[in-house]
């Protein structure tokens, strides 16, 4: 699997989207966790509804959600007032049984905020409000790992 | 011109808490920008620990997430440095700076060392 | 973490010389915005780093235009075209484009 890199900014909600084969995976439940480390285990942040029908409710644990929209075949991610600590390796899963098929891994990237100061100048997005108020935006950059790129790079 | 200068007990016992105020002149910290602490170990290397913005939002350093405080007094224009349960490790000179987000850290206390031993 | 890797650690020169210092980032520095907050700071024995370069290649204030930064992406330089006494010290990159945000480990600028 390749990784695809979502870009999201300090304290503002960031989308992942999982698109997969709505027929291969019909009736599966999805998850979303974190890899933790390299070869590590891959720690369960959230799951869809315990019904598989009901899987386009949204389902929270703590800031994150998931919701999928299985006859489009999309696993939606919702990461709210995104932090450092949300930086890192996720994985997108398909659930049957106790197994877990991978449909996306994931790289977090947590940005600096451009609205910590109001004399931003050219922090600002371009075409996007510059009032306080409307810049809860959902962000949602993503792009494949490039090659070079570390998704865990060695601790200094 | 704005100024900031650390202050706050050069030693700390293990397991304590370090406490250090910076102190603002010549500008607001509620006006704008992020008020940041930094601090460099022995040997030179810097650690960014966290900031509190103007409008008092808080990020910090997932490394010290559960240790780390930063608070302010706006009447009085400081902002303050907590950081529990220290350990030999924690021996450093800590600095404030204000980050702006297109010059970085362009202005600096002139650091305070703080000597975590029993 | 981004991690900040400088090279080299300690670079001896003598007074006149050009001296080059090299960053490189474990990820792109480049923001959604389009901007790479890529710094550079001197920190001389015994005081506070002081900013010199910012976003890859604007001098601050009051910097000397023998200071020069350039770069892109994860692949950075400072360039001093000649040395002179006041600029020994340590020179640190730094990047503010991560919410986490990190340093190089410092390069020491000393005579030959």
């Known amino acids: 699997h390749n990784t695809t890199v979502f870009q999201g900014v300090a304290g503002q909600s960031l989308q992942v989207s999982c698109p997969y084969d709505s027929m291969k995976h019909w009736g599966r439940r999805k998850a979303w966790c974190r890899q933790l480390g390299e070869k590590g285990p891959c720690q369960r942040v959230v799951s869809t509804h315990n019904l598989w029908l009901l899987s386009f409710l949204r389902r929270w644990n703590g800031s994150t959600a998931i919701t999928d929209d299985t006859l489009g075949g999309t696993l939606t991610i919702t990461l709210r007032n995104l932090q450092p600590h949300d930086a890192g390796l996720y994985q997108c899963q398909s659930l049957h049984g106790s197994e877990a098929d991978t449909l996306r891994k994931v790289l977090v990237e947590v940005l600096a905020d451009p609205l910590d100061h109001r004399d931003a100048g050219d922090l600002w997005f371009p075409g996007e409000s510059e009032s306080f108020e409307d810049a809860h935006v959902e962000h949602s950059i993503s792009r494949s790992l490039l090659e070079g790129e570390i998704p865990f790079p060695p601790t200094s | 011109d704005v100024q900031l200068q650390e202050s706050g007990p050069g030693l700390v016992k293990p397991s304590q808490s370090l406490s250090l105020t910076c102190t603002v002149t010549?500008?607001?910290?509620?006006?704008?920008?992020?008020w940041n602490w930094i601090r460099q170990f022995p040997g030179n290397k810097l650690e960014w620990m966290g900031y509190?913005?103007?409008?008092?939002?808080?990020i910090y350093n997932p490394s010290l997430k559960s240790r780390i405080s930063i608070t302010r007094d706006t009447s009085k224009n400081h902002f303050f440095l907590q950081l529990i349960s220290v350990t030999t490790e924690d021996t450093a000179t800590y600095y404030c700076a204000r980050w702006n987000g297109n010059y970085g850290f362009a202005y600096w206390g002139q650091g305070t060392l703080v000597t975590v031993s029993a | 973490d981004v991690v900040m890797t400088q090279n080299p650690l300690s670079l001896p020169v003598s007074l006149g010389d050009q001296a080059s210092i090299s960053c490189r980032s474990s990820q792109s520095l480049v923001h959604i915005n389009g901007n790479t907050y890529l710094h550079w700071y001197l920190q001389k024995p015994g005081q506070s780093p002081k900013l010199l370069i910012y976003k890859v290649s604007n001098r601050f204030s009051g910097v000397p235009d023998r200071f020069s930064g350039s770069g892109s992406g994860t692949d950075f330089t400072l360039k001093i075209s000649r040395v002179e006494a006041e600029d020994l010290g340590v020179y640190f990159c730094?990047?503010?484009?991560?919410?986490?945000?990190?340093f190089g480990s410092g390069t020491k600028l000393e005579i030959k």
């Open positions: 010549g500008y607001s910290i509620t006006s704008d920008y992020a």
């Open positions: 730094s990047q503010t484009t991560h919410a986490l945000f990190t």
């Open positions: 509190i913005n103007y409008s008092g939002r808080t």
